[in-house]
Each structure stands twice: as C-alpha cells, then as structure tokens.
C-alpha cells in the first residue's frame, strides 16, 4: 500500500531559523500537500511535478523546495512563533495517504530550554503549553487573510 514517510518527527528551532521537512513516497502521486493541522487544517503548500507550486500567502517568500513530488524536501525560512504547529504531508493518490506529521516548535531564543522534542512521533492533538508569562499566537488565527473570492457565475 502507498504510504508517506515524513521526517523529522519533531524539531525545536529559534525564531528566524529554518526547518526542513521531507516527504517521501513510493511514487504514483498526483501531487502532495503540506498542511498545518488544527481545528481548521490549513494548506501550506501544494506541489506537483511540472507545475508552479502554490503556497499559502503567510509563507510566500519563506519556502523553498528541492527534489520531486515523490521525494520532496520543503524548507521553511524565517520562522515565527506563530508558525509553531504540526505539519503533515498528504499525498494525492486514489486513496488519502498521510505522513506521520512534524511538530515544529518555534521558540524565543531565551526560552530554548523550555521544551525539547522527544523521540516519539508528534500527536496532532495538542501542542505543549506555552511557558508562563508568554503566549504563542494560535497558528490558525495568526495566518494571513485568504485570497478574496474569485468571481464566478452560474451557467
């Protein structure tokens, strides 16, 4: 059966740094998404070989790609506290195929010791509580407004 290998499981990085997320499959894809999980999952990128990638406006100018849709490395640059969250690869095939997820913890430099990644794969259910006296913006509400609706007409 088709599956998506995703790495790393978890990474802790300071504000302004970069992170690589790799999504690998055995091929036969139409394309692949990187999505940020949450109450309302949000597409971050859609990548399809031979097509210009589509990127969420919150990340435009901050994402690079290397490889192909079957073995794609996504680099997110200039990370912000609001980028903290769990990111999962989703392959478009005849059935839905998901990666195990990558928990990205973006910390202020002085709070680097607050939380470190464990070896266990991330659980999409919850992020660690923020340190006392500081608040992480909600990744969902922190995102930029979506593009305005395109005009369409009924036939």
């Amino acid at each position: 059966a088709q599956e998506v290998q995703q790495s790393p499981h978890c990474t802790t990085v300071p504000v302004g740094a970069s992170v690589n997320i790799t999504c690998s499959t055995s091929g036969g894809l139409r394309g692949i998404y990187l999505r940020q999980l949450g109450p309302q999952p949000q597409d971050i990128i859609y990548y399809e070989d031979g097509v210009v990638p589509t990127t969420d406006r919150r990340f435009r100018g901050r994402i690079d790609f290397s490889g192909s849709q079957d073995n794609l490395t996504i680099t997110m640059h200039r990370l912000q506290l609001s980028d903290t969250g769990t990111y999962t690869c989703q392959a478009i095939t005849e059935v839905n195929v998901y990666g195990s997820g990558t928990l990205v913890l973006v910390t202020e430099e002085q709070s680097q010791g607050w939380h470190r990644c464990s070896d266990a794969p991330p659980r999409a259910s919850a992020l660690p509580a923020p340190p006392t006296g500081s608040a992480l913006p909600d990744p969902q509400t922190a995102s930029a407004l979506p593009d305005p609706p395109a005009a369409s007409a009924l036939p």
């Epitope: 139409r30 394309g31 998404y33 999505r35 309302q40 999952p41 949000q42 597409d43 990128i45 859609y46 399809e48 589509t54 990127t55 969420d56 989703q90 478009i92 839905n96 979506p146 593009d147 305005p148 609706p149 395109a150 369409s152």
Partner: nanobody
Framework: AVQLVDSGGGLVQPGGSLRLSCAAS????????MSWYRQAPGKERELVAT????????NYEDSVKGRFTISRDNAKDTGYLQMNSLKPEDTAVYYC???????????????WGQGTQVTVSS
C-alpha cells in the same frame, strides 16, 4: 482554462440508475469541495449532495438519501454522482460545482459545470 465538464445524463425509466461524472481541468481539484446541484423546469436550483476535499465526509439532500452516492477521485480530477432507484421527480438538469473551503490554498474560488440533463420517465 478552468473547466468542469458534466456528463452521464440521459433518459432512464423509473427505478433505473445513472452515474454522472464531473471532470475538472485547469485547477487543482483536490483543493475544492465538490457538490452536485439540480434544477427542474420552473424551479430553483437545489443542492443534492456535497463531498469534502478528500472524501472524508459527504452530505445529501433528504429526498435522495439512500439512493444517491457522491464520490470523487482526486488522482483523476473527477467527481461522481451514482443515482439509483430514480424517480420522475429526479428529472432535472444536474450541475457539478467545485468550491474551495476555508483552509484551502484556493479559498473562495468557485466553479460550475455546464449541466447534464437527467430525465426519468416511462
């Protein structure tokens, strides 16, 4: 160019079946929820069934529950409506619709097919 092409309509006897198809091109189909609407002569267009982007959830208008099944194949950029136990009151032009929901990279975009005629008559 963005296009949704509806097909599979026709004349069928009561109790019969049809499978409608909706082929998408020019956009990323998996970024869009897909719906089927229908419009009977002299009536307003009504929502028949909707399926989420990745097929994990679907909803149906009460009168078609248990008879119609909506599905999609994102790898083929195509959506389907399987219609069984058809009744004369199902006679209408059926339109497919693709709408990008919140969370999609294409949020707010909305496309329509040209429609396919379904006639249920003996």
């Amino acid at each position: 160019a963005v296009q949704l092409v509806d097909s599979g309509g026709g004349l069928v006897q009561p109790g019969g079946s049809l499978r409608l198809s909706c082929a998408a091109s020019g956009f990323t189909f998996s970024g869009f929820a897909m719906s089927w609407y229908r419009q009977a002569p002299g009536k307003e267009r009504e929502l028949v069934a909707t399926i989420s982007r990745f097929g994990e959830s679907s909803n149906y208008e009460d009168s078609v529950k248990g008879r119609f099944t909506i599905s999609r194949d994102n790898a083929k950029d195509t959506g389907y409506l399987q219609m069984n136990s058809l009744k004369p009151e199902d006679t209408a032009v059926y339109y497919c619709n693709a709408e990008a929901p919140a969370g999609s990279l294409w949020y707010g975009n909305n496309y329509w097919g040209q429609g396919t005629q379904v006639t249920v008559s003996s």
